[in-house]
């Protein structure tokens, strides 16, 4: 009779993580008598996956009934596959012996590869805010996927970005892989409502890519522009001066009025108005009693925005003549809108 052969018909098997892998094995003869064992690996360090005779193999089931006398199908199923299960599996026939069974013949092996989905991409921006016209970096990371082939794209408000670098790690063979990408984005004044999106496409996602997003509102700082104007006389000897703080973001802003360099009033932007682009406007009023001053008054509106160095705009109030409407513009950037009277 022809000597027993162990046939593993599948050179390789590809299974999605979480699914069941079927590893096929048949013997060509019932002789010699002895059990089949499945191993991962072929050397002395090989791992026992299934032993027909004894042992504990909670994830393994046999395809056919191995207790039947004429059974020659020794295929197994391994449940709940993870990337850590990847490797070469060998079906090995043992010959009954005393005191121990002796390895008789091995199959050629089946390479089990595991398809694993990438984790949801995590996008992170710079630690500190930056102002328009500056270039900032965003990173995107996704882990745990297999096979290695993967596509990553960056978008800003739906427009694809081209200035980015991507690495898939490790370079060689692995159970699973990670992707890391860094994109450069130039900020504009209109970016408060903008989003940066990292999109990952992988064979396991069946054409439905995963996306990670970052809101530029967490990255951008738009400095305010200041304008100080003198309003017509409200009452005898009283002049109303306003400081308009325009187009700033984020809202955190503190305004200080100075009269001839001396602090007159400090307030924090609270009731602001929001512009369409997401920036804020705010206005502060100062009522100045002209009769209390002999000389001309220098009024300064000083704004500290989001912890940055203060910007200011001054206005000279003439005391000698009857006050007329005067104005003075200032350029600086910020956002907010709050109307208050200062008495």
């Amino acid at each position: 009779e022809e000597e027993l052969q162990v046939i593993q018909p599948d050179k390789s098997v590809l299974v999605a993580a979480g699914e069941t892998a079927t590893l096929r094995c048949t013997a060509t003869s019932l002789i010699p008598v002895g059990p089949i064992q499945w191993f991962r690996g072929a050397g002395p360090g090989r791992e026992l996956i299934y032993n027909q005779k004894e042992g504990h193999f909670p994830r393994v089931t046999t395809v056919s009934d191995l207790t039947k006398r004429n059974n020659m199908d020794f295929s197994i199923r391994i449940g709940n596959i993870t990337p850590a299960d990847a490797g070469t599996y060998y079906c090995v026939k043992f010959r009954k012996g005393s005191p121990d069974d002796v390895e008789f013949k091995s199959g050629a092996g089946t390479e089990l590869s595991v398809r694993a989905k990438p984790s949801a991409p995590v996008v992170s921006g710079p630690a500190a805010r930056a102002t328009p016209q500056h270039t900032v970096s965003f990173t995107c990371e996704s882990h745990g996927f297999s096979p290695r082939d993967i596509t990553l794209k960056w978008f800003k408000n739906g427009n694809e970005l081209s200035d980015f670098q991507t690495n898939v790690d490790p370079v060689g063979e692995s159970v699973s892989y990670s992707i890391h990408s860094t994109a450069k984005v130039v900020l504009t004044r209109e970016d408060v409502h903008s989003q940066v999106i990292c999109e990952v496409a992988h064979v396991t996602l069946q054409g439905d890519p995963l996306r990670g997003t970052a809101n530029l509102s967490e990255t951008i700082r738009v400095p305010p522009t200041l304008e100080v104007t003198q309003q017509p006389v409200r009452a005898e000897n009283q002049v109303n001066v306003t400081c308009q703080v325009r187009k700033f973001y984020p809202q955190r802003l503190q305004l200080t009025w100075l009269e001839n360099g001396n602090v007159s009033r400090t307030e924090t932007a609270s009731t602001v108005t929001e512009n369409k682009d997401g920036t804020y406007n705010w206005m502060s009023w100062l009522l100045v009693n002209v009769s209390a001053h002999r000389d001309d008054v220098k009024l300064t509106c000083q704004v500290e925005h989001d912890g940055q160095p203060a910007v200011s705009k001054s206005h000279d109030l003439k005391v000698s003549a009857h006050p007329k409407e005067q104005g003075s513009n200032t350029a600086a950037e910020n956002t907010g809108s709050n109307e208050r009277n200062i008495y």
Epitope: Q37, F39, R40, G41, A42, G43, P44, G45, R46, E47, L48, I49, N51, G55, H56, F57, G87, T88, V92, F94, P99, D100, D101, V102, E103, G109, E111, P170, V171, G172, E173, S174
Partner: antibody, heavy 118, light 114 residues
């Protein structure tokens, strides 16, 4: 969590014997090949012996063949190394290690020191 | 027996630097049937037992930081630490894990942090 705890080391005279024990937990012991690896005082690592999974196959470094015997008790989750005819060159830290599935050593115990000296 | 040779025997690097160490085998560790290189890398910190970093030359063990990168094929292999950290102070050993016994280790590379 995989745990391997060695014991049984000590000071022994040349020609003497010693039995090392490795108590394993945190995995299905019988499914894995188990090995002994030693580290010499010069910090060189040497594979000593392996007991296979799924069959009573044992493998030895040439220098210890006939003097050392590796055995396992799957019911007790324990690996043993019986050492006899000990030589000064056997002085080392002996580690119990669980093999990966193709010959590397995935987990190591904390080691037990064997000193062979007159 | 397959002889494993590591170089350098020691090196000192500053935190954040890229570290590379070499391991050469006296015969090829590439298995032609599955195209895998049977080489592992271990880290042994002072007073501790060795810890597996990489097997099959480049497959990083679960839980190992991705700054550890194994590469190479045939007889020439490299372990790279892309940005060395203070906690990476250790001895690093390579091992061939072919089916042909005995399994053998390199003499080690001692990494010191400046």
């Amino acid at each position: 969590e995989v745990m391997l705890v060695e014991s049984g080391g000590g000071l022994v005279k040349p020609g003497g014997s010693l039995k090392l024990t490795c108590a394993a937990s945190g995995f299905i012991f019988s499914n894995y090949a188990m090995s002994w690896v030693r580290q010499t005082p010069e910090k060189r690592l040497e594979w000593v012996a392996t007991f296979s999974s799924g069959g009573s196959y044992t493998y030895y470094q040439d220098s210890v063949k006939g003097r050392f015997t590796v055995s396992r008790d799957n019911a007790k989750n324990t690996l043993y190394l019986q050492m006899s005819s000990l030589r000064s060159e056997d002085t080392a830290m002996y580690y119990c290690a669980r093999s990966g599935w193709d010959g590397w050593f995935a987990y190591w115990g904390q080691g037990t020191l064997v000193t062979v000296s007159a | 027996d397959i002889v494993m040779t590591q170089s350098p025997s020691s090196l000192a690097m500053s935190v954040g630097q890229k570290v590379t160490m070499s391991c050469k085998s006296s015969q090829s560790l590439l298995n032609s049937s599955n195209q895998k290189n049977y080489l592992a890398w271990y880290q042994q910190k002072p007073g501790q037992s060795p810890k597996l970093l990489v097997y099959f030359a480049s497959t990083r063990e679960s839980g190992v930081p991705d700054r550890f990168i194994g590469s190479g094929s045939g007889t020439d292999f490299t372990l790279t630490i892309s940005s060395v950290q203070a906690e990476d102070l250790a001895n690093y050993f390579c091992q061939q894990h072919c089916s042909t016994l005995p399994w053998t280790f390199g003499g080690g590379t001692k990494l010191e942090i400046k």
